[in-house]
């Protein structure tokens, strides 16, 4: 799996989307962990409701809800009040029984301000940014 | 795991470049933040940079003084400051952060190097 | 930014004593608060983080707790190694930022 960054400033809030194929995880439901260590577990933060067909209803845990269009196949997470310490490696999954498929990983960035954005212009609108290979070096 | 560059004295404004070369772990991992110590002062957070996208966050105080950059081949962390004044005299550490943040803080600091800015 | 007010900013003590510091947050940090030692040649070791958890390879006689605004640092037995500086960091939010320090010295 590629990373795809999300890059938001702190004390607002961010949207992460994680597009997947509605046919292939029909009547699975969905969730969003934090990547804690590189052997380390995901962490569960929050998933979607019990009952699939009920997978559109908003789901809260703290600052963070989730909300799956399963017809159009799109995860969407809101991180809201960001602060720094959400920033961090994150999952979307596709749950089935105790197994978890992984939908997209996602690099969650939190700027102290908005012209810290690297490549910044004028004006620069929080959200995704492009992907970047995994190039994790053995030791 | 952080070796930072040597002492400089350098004159009053121009720029210094000092490096923080980290070893043992996955550079592009962990984030590294950049801490000011004044001569019997305390601490300050300059900035951050995570390493694996280049993305940056300053302390307001830092910003256009401080220029955070790493370069990945060589597992090296960089902190330019310009237009040195007598004020930017300190020793200067970078610490690393936690695993695509700072969710646990700075775990592991450097030895520190030490700017002198006089004519 | 969020200030952190360190107490006391300088401590005597004797070997054995049981000592503790103080950090105030001017703001609500929801215990994103470590605590750092400095020894004299200026090397800088993180003791606690997430305001009470032990870094490894620290000794049990370090413990950190809160009490609402209110984080402590408490050294049980005092060790000669002990004597040092210490300093709180909250990573809260930007900007994070540090207690002014406490010089523990040898009474």
């Known amino acids: 799996h590629n990373t795809t960054v999300f890059q938001g400033v702190a004390g607002q809030s961010l949207q992460v989307s994680c597009p997947y194929d509605s046919m292939k995880h029909w009547g699975r439901r969905k969730a969003w962990c934090r990547q804690l260590g590189e052997k380390g577990p995901c962490q569960r933060v929050v998933s979607t409701h019990n009952l699939w067909l009920l997978s559109f209803l908003r789901r809260w845990n703290g600052s963070t809800a989730i909300t799956d269009d399963t017809l159009g196949g799109t995860l969407t997470i809101t991180l809201r009040n960001l602060q720094p310490h959400d920033a961090g490696l994150y999952q979307c999954q596709s749950l089935h029984g105790s197994e978890a498929d992984t939908l997209r990983k996602v690099l969650v960035e939190v700027l102290a301000d908005p012209l810290d954005h690297r490549d910044a212009g004028d004006l620069w609108f929080p959200g995704e940014s492009e992907s970047f290979e995994d190039a994790h070096v053995e030791h | 795991q952080l070796q930072e560059s040597g002492p400089v004295l350098v004159k009053p404004g121009a720029s210094v470049k000092m490096s923080c070369k980290a070893s043992g772990y996955t550079f592009t991992d962990y984030y590294m933040n950049w801490v000011k110590q004044s001569h019997g002062k305390s601490l300050e957070w300059i900035g951050v940079?995570?390493?694996?996208?280049?993305?940056?966050s300053y302390n307001q105080k830092f910003k256009g003084k401080a220029t955070l950059t790493v370069d990945k081949s060589s597992s090296t962390a960089y902190m330019e400051l310009n237009s040195l004044t007598s004020e930017d005299s300190a020793v200067y550490y970078c610490a690393r952060g936690t695993y695509y943040s700072n969710y646990e803080g700075f775990p592991y600091w450097g030895q520190g190097t030490l700017v002198t800015v006089s004519a | 930014d969020i200030q952190m007010t360190q107490s006391p900013s300088s401590l005597s003590a004797s070997l054995g004593e049981r000592v503790s510091l103080t950090c105030r947050a001017s703001q609500e940090i929801s215990g994103y608060l470590s605590w750092l030692q400095q020894k004299p040649d200026g090397t800088i070791k993180r003791l606690i983080y997430?305001?009470?958890t032990l870094d490894s390879g620290v000794p049990k006689r370090f413990s950190g707790s809160r009490s609402g605004s209110d984080y402590s640092l408490t050294i049980s037995s005092l060790e000669s190694e002990d004597f040092a500086d210490y300093y709180c960091l909250q990573y809260a939010s930007y900007p994070y930022t540090f207690g002014g320090g406490t010089k523990l010295e040898i009474k």
């Open positions: 940079i995570n390493p694996y996208t280049g993305a940056t």
């Open positions: 997430a305001a009470s």
